[in-house]
């Protein structure tokens, strides 16, 4: 990974020396906590017959408030620590009179990184010591000499997962415009293991490295209005704590059973993705649990296979997107990748090939927004606590923060007419820039229909008339009838269904007998009543992979990795009529509801989830007794 | 608020023997699996016996059988591990555990005692 001659892996490079641009005379005191990387910084490199200026701002959302990182000290424990004085040399912007560029550096010791001009994607890296005015590669990433890698996720594992794959669903957007929605934030804690730690050699050198890869990941995601935060890093210097198999469908079913034990004690995150030196089998240098995003098996592994950091960028980017529910590229009629044949592929595309691509394509970017409509996507919404972002508020980085009323990213990327970019204030005579109920910059009035209900265990929104955001997605109450069991927070979970999910189209629950089992560690069962709950136990199908099985007659219980606990039938599944497993017994339906909520509606709406009323168009909660025109008017703040 | 407290550990020479005590508090466990694990540094946590909440029904690791058992008194709320024929690879801190629900994963953890076997 860092050999001592780095250009020795390049066929062909450019040698430059990068020429920093003095910064502008007049500039805003900054916080001392900011430290000895500038806020903002230019350069000036000559590549390819041209003079590319980049002009950089440091990522200060790359790093989540709590962002911890844990590593075994010498003693021999396990250290978990939030570092203090976070500031960090890591950057991104565009170059110069290239309205569709972007760039994403680190300058801790010379540049590091890629810039992209048009469809060409340029990787510069120092070639010595000289910092960032010696001489450094610039080079495209074909130049790079490495095999091909390929994702392990296969065809026939996302076909019953994604649904009919036809041209149909993709009617493409016009390139340079962000998805209207809100931006959706992923909260990733990455664990690097041994054999990377090994290779890099130090802590130091393995939290660079990562950082550079997430501000990459960030970099290519926000085309997609996502950002990337890393709120936590895991290093394993001393010894790995799962068993990382050159199998990489063994060491993410590991990574997910660790993950699943590790949960309570370590960071509540959206995603969890391992970075290891590990060769996987083959050509794989990827593998990801799809559409698992914000579920217990959000996450992938990913093998660092290429000198250059942008290449795990590139592969972390891509399985997050199976994790988000995007399908390859090369799977969908009429998907159409905007990128220039020659230069390489997009993203999802099945194999790199020989350069790292830069963007995602059309039919991604369909997959995403149809995953975006699920329930299970909500984990997305949630913004890293704005108040502790790293650095402070900073207009231009798509977090819409104190002191500011939208935030459409720098100016060079902003699409948005009705957001002044340059000081994040609302144009003038704008109500609003962001939000599903924000159209041609007015708050669309209220009753209006934002968010359609997506199956029986949903409820329908309306924009109220005074806010561009949608309510938040509200689902029917609790124990209302679906599809063979009864909804819980917006699913209709089935024992039929979870042994699908575990086991494949041909799992289904195992006989009722095998209920009356609870398992022991080393597979041993001790009788219990026989109440549906506890223990999943299911037949059929197929074992999934890396999970090790107890069987005791006819029933099939998933153990964890290291087979001390077995995988839980999960709340809310339907165990009997009318009735439901909570806290691990079969009870009956009213533990859902403590109170009569339907009847304070008013007969204008519907108690939810979290037995509130859910509105019906028009009127106003918290118990629909009054239409909300009523109410606004009464305030003074019809818009 | 839920609590795992483990007490009895110590040092002791190897032959001898040693009884941890588990209490837990803040809600009733009788139905779930209860357990003990060990850790020394730089090693993963290691399953050393558990008990169900129904039949009593006891399950250890290779290890340990025969020389460790566990037990359980409902109407205390607690879970004891005697441990007879101490070896210096006992040597560990030791952690009772709870299932949340019963077939769940053990969220419920203590604190840790110390074991500590010479030779």
């Known amino acids: 990974i860092a050999p001592s001659r780095p250009w020795a892996l390049m066929e062909q490079y450019e040698v430059v020396l990068p020429w920093r641009l003095p910064g502008p005379r007049v500039r805003r005191a900054l916080p001392s906590h900011l430290g000895l990387h500038p806020e903002r910084v230019s350069y000036v490199l000559g590549a390819t017959g041209h003079n590319f200026t980049l002009h950089l701002r440091k990522n200060r959302d790359l790093l989540g408030s709590g962002y911890t990182e844990t590593y075994t000290a010498a003693n021999g424990s396990e250290v978990t620590e939030q570092p203090r004085g976070q500031d960090h040399c890591f950057y991104q912007g565009h170059v110069e009179g290239y309205p569709d560029s972007a760039a994403s550096l680190s300058t801790c010791a010379g540049l590091r990184g890629f810039f992209q001009v048009g469809s060409d994607l340029h990787l510069i890296e120092p070639l010595d010591e000289g910092g960032e005015g010696g001489r450094h590669a610039v080079y495209q990433a074909e130049h790079l000499l490495q095999t091909a890698g390929t994702c392990g996720v296969s065809d026939d594992s996302l076909g019953s997962l994604l649904g009919p794959r036809t041209a149909a669903v993709f009617r493409p957007r016009p390139g340079d415009s962000l998805p209207s929605r809100e931006t959706r934030y992923v909260e990733l804690y990455v664990v690097v293991d041994n054999a990377e730690f090994q290779m890099l050699g130090s802590e130091a050198a393995v939290r660079h490295r990562v950082l550079e890869v997430v501000n990459h990941v960030d970099k290519l995601y926000q085309k997609l209005n996502f950002r990337v935060v890393l709120v936590g890093l895991e290093i394993w210097n001393s010894q790995d704590r799962f068993h990382v198999s050159p199998d990489p469908s063994v060491t993410l079913e590991n990574l997910l059973t660790w993950q699943a034990r590790q949960r309570t004690r370590r960071h509540l995150h959206d995603n969890v993705q391992l970075i290891t030196g590990v060769d996987f089998t083959g050509t794989t240098v990827g593998f990801a649990r799809v559409s698992a995003m914000c579920s217990h098996s959000s996450g992938a592994v990913n093998q660092d296979h290429s000198k250059n950091p942008v290449g795990v960028a590139c592969t972390m980017a891509h399985e997050m997107g199976h994790n988000l529910g995007m399908d390859h590229d090369e799977n969908v009629q009429g998907c159409r990748c905007q990128e220039r044949f020659e230069a390489g592929r997009c993203i999802m595309a099945g194999s790199i090939g020989s350069s790292f691509p830069r963007m995602f394509s059309d039919c991604s970017q369909a997959y995403l927004e149809s995953f975006l409509e699920r329930p299970q996507s909500v984990c997305l919404a949630n913004a890293p606590d704005l108040s502790h972002l790293v650095g402070g508020p900073v207009c231009g980085n798509l977090f819409v923060e104190r002191g500011e009323q939208c935030d459409c990213g720098p100016p060079e990327d902003c699409r948005n007419r009705c957001c002044n970019s340059t000081t994040c204030q609302l144009a003038e005579g704008a109500q609003c820039a962001h939000g599903t109920c924000c159209q041609e910059c007015k708050v669309k009035p209220a009753g209006e229909l934002c968010r359609p209900k997506k199956d029986m265990c949903d409820l329908e929104e309306f924009c109220d008339g005074r806010h561009p955001e949608c309510p938040e997605d509200a689902f029917q109450e609790n124990g209302t009838p679906c599809s063979g069991g009864y909804c819980y927070n917006g699913a209709c979970p089935t024992l039929a269904q979870q042994c699908q999910a575990f086991w494949g189209p041909g799992g289904q629950a195992a006989e009722e007998s095998c209920f009356s089992y609870d398992i022991l560690p080393g597979c041993k069962a001790s009788r219990y009543r026989a109440d549906m709950c506890g223990v999943l136990q299911c037949k059929g199908g197929q074992q999934p992979l890396g999970r090790a099985i107890c069987i005791v007659d006819v029933c099939h219980a998933l153990t964890t990795e290291d087979g001390t606990a077995y995988e839980p039938v999960p709340e809310g599944t339907r165990c009997g009529p009318e009735k439901v497993c909570w806290k691990g017994r079969c009870q009956d339906l009213h533990v859902y509801r403590s109170s009569n909520c339907s009847a304070q509606c008013h007969n204008h709406g519907v108690c939810n989830h979290k037995q509130e009323c859910h509105c019906h168009a028009g009127w106003a909660p918290p118990h629909c007794a009054k239409l909300l025109t009523e109410v606004h008017a009464a305030s003074g703040s019809l818009p | 608020e839920v609590q795992l407290v483990e007490s009895g550990g110590g040092l002791v020479q190897a032959g001898g023997s040693l009884r941890l005590s588990c209490a837990a508090s803040?809600?009733?466990?009788?139905?779930?699996?209860m357990g003990w694990f060990r850790q020394t540094p730089g090693m993963k946590r290691e399953f050393v016996a558990a008990i169900s909440g129904s039949e009593n029904v006891t399950s250890y690791a290779d290890s340990v059988k025969g020389r460790f058992t566990i037990s359980r008194d409902n109407a205390k709320n607690t879970v004891t591990l005697q441990m007879n024929s101490l070896k210096p690879e006992d040597t560990a801190v030791y952690y009772c555990?709870?299932?949340?629900?019963?077939?769940?994963?053990?969220?419920?953890w203590g604190q840790g005692t110390q074991v500590t076997v010479s030779s």
């Open positions: 555990a709870a299932q949340r629900w019963r077939g769940g994963s053990y969220e419920y």
């Open positions: 803040g809600r009733t466990f009788s139905e779930v699996v």
